[in-house]
C-alpha cells in the first residue's frame, strides 16, 4: 500500500511570493497513482483543490482561477509538488496531499 | 445550451469610465471562476482579470491594475469589468470567459467592442 | 511574467497538406498547463487542445498537441478549409496567464 509523507510542517512566505509544498510517496509507483491535494483554512471545511492523474491529466477545483495553483511530479524523487503562486493571506490553511490507487 | 453574453461596449473618450456586463446561461455559473480577455483589431489575445467563484481571489493583468475592477454576482449568473481611466490602448473586444476544470478557457461569449477615442 | 513565442507568423498551406505549429515559452511550463485555440474572423476563440495533448470536446482527431518543458507543437494531419485560422497557444500555470502572438494558417 502506498504511503504518503509532506517533509516540511509548515511554510511561511511573503505576501505575493510563491509556496512550494511536497508530498513523497512510497511503497507504490508515483506513475501509477493520482495525486490529490486538499487545503483546510481555519474554522472551514476540507476542500478539494488539485489533482495530477496516472496519466498526467491535472484536474483542479473549478472555482479557483487558473494559475493559481498548480501541480507536477517528479517521478525520478516520487514526490509530487503543490506551488502556490502570488501567496495572500486567503492562503492561510493547511495543506494535505492524498492518494488514489489505480 | 452554454452560454456567456456580454454587453456595456461603446466609444468612451480617454479618461472616461465603462462597466462591462456578461450573463451565463447553462451552466452553474456560481460554482465556476470566470475571465475577461480583450482583443485589440487586428491583434492578439490579452488575459485581462481573474476572479474566484467565491470572488475570494482576484488576479489582474499589470497594464490594468489600478484602473480595472472584476467582480460577479452569483445570484444574477453575471460577470462584470469596471473600467476606469481609459485609454486609447485599451480599445479592443472584450471577451467574458470561463475556465474549466483542466484550466484553459473552454467557453467563451462573443465579445463587446470598446473604443476609447477623443 | 511568462512569454509566447509562435512561428511561424504565417503558414501557407493547402487544403489537405499538414501544418505544424510551433510554440515556444520563456520558461519551462509543465505540459499540463499548455492549450491551443483556434480563431476565425469576426469570432471569438475555440479550445482545440488543453494540457498539451488532449483535445477540447468535439474538436476533430486531425488536430494533436505535443511537447514539453519550452517547445510545444500543434499538428493539424490534413487541412480541411475550415481549419484556415489564427492559432494561439497558451499558458495557465501561473498568473499572468499568457498567450502566443499566434499563427495565421491561410491558404496557398
Known amino acids: 500500500a502506498g504511503h504518503l509523507e509532506q517533509p516540511q510542517i509548515s511554510s511561511t512566505k511573503t505576501l505575493s511570493k510563491t509556496a512550494r509544498l511536497e508530498c513523497v510517496v512510497s511503497g507504490i509507483t508515483i506513475s501509477a497513482t493520482s495525486v490529490y491535494w486538499y487545503r483546510e483554512r481555519p474554522g472551514e471545511v476540507i476542500q478539494f483543490l488539485v489533482s495530477i492523474s496516472y496519466d498526467g491529466t491535472v484536474r483542479k477545483e473549478s472555482g479557483i482561477p487558473s494559475g493559481k495553483f498548480e501541480v507536477d511530479r517528479i517521478p525520478e524523487t516520487s514526490t509530487s509538488t503543490l506551488t502556490i503562486h502570488n501567496v495572500e493571506k486567503q492562503d492561510i490553511a493547511t495543506y494535505y496531499c492524498a492518494l488514489w490507487e489505480v | 445550451e452554454v452560454q456567456l453574453v456580454e454587453s456595456g461596449g461603446g466609444l468612451v473618450k480617454p479618461g472616461g469610465s465603462l462597466r462591462l456586463s456578461c450573463e451565463a446561461s447553462?451552466?452553474?455559473?456560481?460554482?465556476?471562476?470566470m475571465n475577461w480577455v480583450r482583443q485589440a483589431p487586428g491583434k492578439g489575445l490579452e488575459w485581462v482579470s481573474s476572479i474566484s467563484s467565491t470572488s475570494d481571489y482576484i488576479f489582474n493583468a499589470d497594464s490594468v491594475k489600478g484602473r480595472f475592477t472584476i467582480s460577479r454576482d452569483n445570484a444574477k449568473n453575471s460577470l462584470y469589468l469596471q473600467m476606469n481611466s481609459l485609454r486609447a490602448e485599451d480599445t479592443a473586444v472584450y471577451y467574458c470567459?470561463?475556465?474549466?476544470?483542466?484550466?484553459?478557457?473552454?467557453?467563451w461569449g462573443q465579445g463587446t467592442m470598446v473604443t476609447v477615442s477623443s | 511574467e511568462i512569454v509566447l513565442t509562435q512561428s511561424p507568423g504565417t503558414l501557407s498551406l493547402s487544403p489537405g497538406e499538414r501544418a505544424t505549429l510551433s510554440c515556444r515559452t520563456s520558461?519551462?511550463?509543465?505540459?499540463?498547463?499548455l492549450g491551443w485555440y483556434q480563431q476565425k474572423p469576426g469570432q471569438p476563440p475555440r479550445l482545440l487542445i488543453f494540457g498539451s495533448s488532449s483535445r477540447a470536446t468535439g474538436i476533430p482527431d486531425r488536430f494533436s498537441g505535443s511537447g514539453s518543458g519550452t517547445d510545444f507543437t500543434l499538428t493539424i494531419s490534413r487541412l480541411e478549409p475550415e481549419d484556415f485560422a489564427v492559432y494561439y497557444c497558451?499558458?495557465?500555470?501561473?498568473?499572468?496567464?499568457?498567450f502566443g502572438g499566434g499563427t495565421k494558417v491561410d491558404i496557398k
Open positions: 447553462g451552466f452553474t455559473f456560481s460554482i465556476n471562476s
Open positions: 470567459v470561463r475556465d474549466d476544470v483542466f484550466g484553459a478557457f473552454d467557453i
Open positions: 520558461q519551462s511550463v509543465s505540459r499540463s498547463y
Open positions: 497558451q499558458q495557465y500555470s501561473r498568473s499572468p496567464l499568457t
